[in-house]
């Protein structure tokens, strides 16, 4: 029997330092995990301790934190060097900052094979691009070879910006020649390493022949065995064991987000290749395990140029950014029609001709936004005066509701309305009308939604049946503020963009903003 | 060195049951599935059905659903197949064999269980 | 079901001689073919797996070939210990199935 150690990450997303528990920005650093300098120490403890290691990304390192907004890409390249990576899959925020986001900061640069069997390139950018990532990659590993094949989630056109030169196939589809050929140039042993989501993490092992060992990403999925260190809760045992359709017993794993954990599988392998058993948990990489000090203090080298970022005018704004809690938790508020705005403008992708957008709506708890911005100063708006209006380290993710589930978030919104409290939604592709003279639970007395499926925008009647997309703060998918109804009856949930990035590169782009109160949230009654 | 152990002839009568005994050795038995191979005399070889001892998962050909029931003990490493309702054409040589996923080959069979049905 | 079939059930060949025993399927099974000999005691033991991957301490004299739906052992330089019944088995698809046999004889 051969014996090999997978470690493994995925959706990083720009957590270069360590962070607080929550993957927020660390404040007591006793307290603090996770950071590719803690990452690196206990890489190297196993690698020192275990013969045949690999050390895997299951893709998402792009976005987060200003790391990202800054270096574009850059820092991924350079620590993931560092670490030695021995591969990555592609995920879908690696192609945020469009193709050539990709390939000058991390494909050219990258000492490690980055994959994707079931990207295809097309046009012009076919030659570009060849030979920067590949579909799969013949790793030797002590005596033996490894094969690894990649894949990428099929909706990243919806999700990010790859352009219209790269095609995204169907994972099985394209995973399963791959592999084949793998088979014949007689590699025994393959790992599927993607970005797909913990679904598709599954079905890639019921459904592709000769993958015997799943590594994935995108759904942040927490497995473990036994009781769990930290705050997360699994949603399976470590490895979690897929039968495949001709019978294989096959490991699927993930290892949560934000760098929070290693992933830590051990497989032994017989001669022909079975995997013969497969174990281990991922490992929280909590304060007990020292950052390393070279590593360490390189991140302090390249933090100077964040400090520095902070201060710069990102954009101006003529009006008074209102994002008081007087304002945001009781009406609308500019400073929520901006951030929504904002939202809807990321996620502007014309993939379709008979629609202007994929989506349309966006929903924000007015408690998440925490300060007003000043325009009495020259009008300049800075990350750091964002960092105030949204110090949470959010995203804004993107999800499928019913418009029964969005009903229900709209009566949440108002259902104790007066009492200052977070829950009461800031919106934009919506009007609300609100009658607070009804009892909780039936004061939303209309509710238009902004079609997607016409050449001219227009509002329409929400419908209870039809699905939606929405965009809005991971917060609220995850059921925060008490909309538990998004989390338990949401149909899909991508995760999206760095709150704070999504709202600055809005403003450079506008250059100068003035939002306006525009009649989105209405009272039928009352003096509002 | 890998090795099947199968249980010694048996001879039944019609509608009675017989419950055969397959002994591995030399390997990690919880890990690999142990298949299930009928030959009736002077004929091919077909396969019954598979048992995977790990987690007890078990397939059955169409033919042998009812007919075969497929168990394993793993702290003796040993499967077994029970074959119920007895006929005569259930009068055959029974092996089991090991399963390689890799290729879906059976790499190491057990010298066969001689099934003898008569009144 | 995918239906193996070995159409040669029986065949003579001298010792020293090249001999070729072929199977087909019903459907293309992506070269996953196994090939097993029976010894007239009972004995079955894994030729070749995958095609033309020879198991383990089976002697070079043995090889397969094929693809799609045909396929075939070769068995280079015949030796009297080579006297058997040989099977192929599909390992594409559930249920596995086995050719019906090819019984070699000495001439």
């Known amino acids: 029997a051969w014996e090999l150690t997978i470690l493994h990450t995925n959706d990083v997303h720009s957590r270069l330092e360590q962070t607080s528990e929550d993957s927020s920005k660390c404040v007591n650093a006793s307290r603090c995990m996770g950071g590719v300098a803690r990452l690196f120490t206990k890489v190297q403890q196993i690698r020192r301790a275990e013969p045949n290691v690999l050390l895997l990304d299951a893709g998402d390192q792009y976005q987060g934190t200003i790391w990202f907004t800054v270096y574009k890409g850059a820092e991924v390249a350079h620590f993931m060097n560092a670490l030695r990576y021995d591969a990555m899959a592609l995920g879908n925020h690696e192609f945020d900052n469009g193709v050539e986001g990709l390939i000058e900061p991390l494909l050219k640069e990258a000492k490690f094979p980055i994959l994707s069997a079931n990207i295809k390139a097309k046009g012009p950018l076919a030659s570009q691009i060849s030979g920067l990532y590949l579909p799969y990659k013949v790793l030797p590993v002590g005596d033996e070879v490894v094969g690894i094949v990649g894949y990428t989630s099929k909706e990243t056109p919806f999700l990010s910006n790859p352009g219209t030169n790269l095609v995204f196939e169907d994972e099985i589809t394209a995973l399963q020649p791959e592999v084949d050929k793998l088979k014949t140039l007689n590699v025994n042993k393959i790992i599927a390493l993607g970005h797909s989501g913990f679904e598709m993490d599954k079905l890639i092992a019921q459904k592709v022949r000769g993958v015997d060992v799943v590594v994935g990403g995108h759904s942040n999925t927490f497995l473990y065995t036994g009781n769990p260190p930290s705050k997360e809760v699994p949603a399976g045992k470590y490895p979690f064991i897929v039968t495949s359709d001709d019978g294989r017993k096959v490991p699927v794993v993930q290892a949560y987000a934000f760098g929070k954990y290693l992933g830590y599988l051990k497989i032994e392998f017989d001669e022909r290749g079975n995997v013969i058993s497969s174990h281990g948990n991922p490992i929280l990489l909590n304060s007990s395990i020292p950052e390393d000090p070279s590593i360490k203090a390189d991140i302090n080298k390249w933090r100077i140029k964040l400090d520095n970022y902070s201060t710069q005018e990102l954009g101006k704004t003529i009006v008074y950014l209102d994002g008081s809690s007087q304002s945001c938790r009781f009406r609308e508020c500019n400073m929520g029609n901006l951030i929504c705005d904002a939202m809807i403008n990321n996620n502007l992708r014309h993939t379709d001709e008979m629609f202007w957008n994929h989506v349309s709506m966006c929903i924000l708890n007015g408690g998440g936004i925490r300060s007003p911005i000043d325009e009495r100063n020259n009008g300049t708006i800075t990350w750091e005066n964002l960092a105030a209006v949204l110090p949470f380290g959010g995203t804004f993710d993107l999800v499928q509701l019913k418009g029964s589930t969005l009903k229900k978030a709209f009566e949440h919104s108002v259902h104790r309305y007066g009492q200052s409290t977070g829950e009461f939604l800031q919106v934009g592709g919506i009007h609300v009308v609100y009658d607070l003279s009804r009892k909780p639970g039936d004061r939303v007395v209309k509710l238009d939604v902004l079609c997607t499926k016409c050449r001219v925008p227009s509002y329409d009647p929400l419908k209870m049946d039809e699905v939606y997309k929405v965009i809005l703060p991971n917060f609220l998918a995850n059921g925060g503020d008490g909309f538990q109804m998004i989390k338990d009856e949401l149909l899909r949930h991508d995760s999206g963009d760095q709150d704070i990035n999504v709202v600055s590169t809005y403003i450079s782009k506008m250059k100068v903003i003035y939002p306006a109160v525009e009649g989105r949230i209405k009272f039928s009654t009352g003096s509002h | 060195q890998v090795h099947l152990q199968q249980s010694g002839a048996e001879l039944a009568r019609p509608g009675a049951s017989v419950k055969l005994s397959c002994k591995a050795s030399g390997y990690s038995f919880i890990s690999y599935w142990m298949e299930w191979v009928k030959q009736r005399p002077g004929q091919g070889l077909e396969w019954i059905g598979a048992?995977?001892?790990?987690?007890?998962?078990?397939r059955y050909t169409q033919e042998f659903k009812g007919k075969a029931t497929l168990t394993a003990d793993e702290s003796s490493s040993t499967a077994y197949m029970q074959l119920s309702s007895l006929a005569s054409e259930d009068s055959a040589v029974y092996y089991c064999?090991?399963?390689?996923?890799?290729?879906?080959?059976?790499?190491?069979w057990g010298a066969g269980t001689t099934v003898t049905v008569s009144s | 079901d995918i239906q193996m079939t070995q159409t040669t059930s029986s065949l003579s060949a001298s010792l020293g001689d090249r001999v070729t025993i072929s199977c087909r399927a019903s459907?293309?099974?992506?070269?996953?073919l196994n090939w097993y000999q029976q010894k007239p005691d009972g004995t079955v033991k894994l030729l070749i797996h995958y095609t033309s991957r020879l198991h383990s301490g089976v002697p070079s004299r043995f090889s397969g070939s094929g693809s799609g739906t045909d396929y075939s052992l070769t068995i280079s330089n015949l030796e009297q210990e080579d006297i058997a019944t040989y099977f192929c088995?599909?390992?594409?698809?559930?249920?596995?199935?086995f050719g019906g046999g090819t019984k070699l004889e000495i001439k």
């Open positions: 064999a090991r399963g390689n996923w890799d290729d879906w080959d059976f790499d190491v």
């Open positions: 459907q293309d099974i992506s070269n996953y």
């Open positions: 048992i995977y001892p790990g987690d007890g998962d078990t």
């Open positions: 088995q599909q390992g594409n698809t559930l249920p596995w199935t």
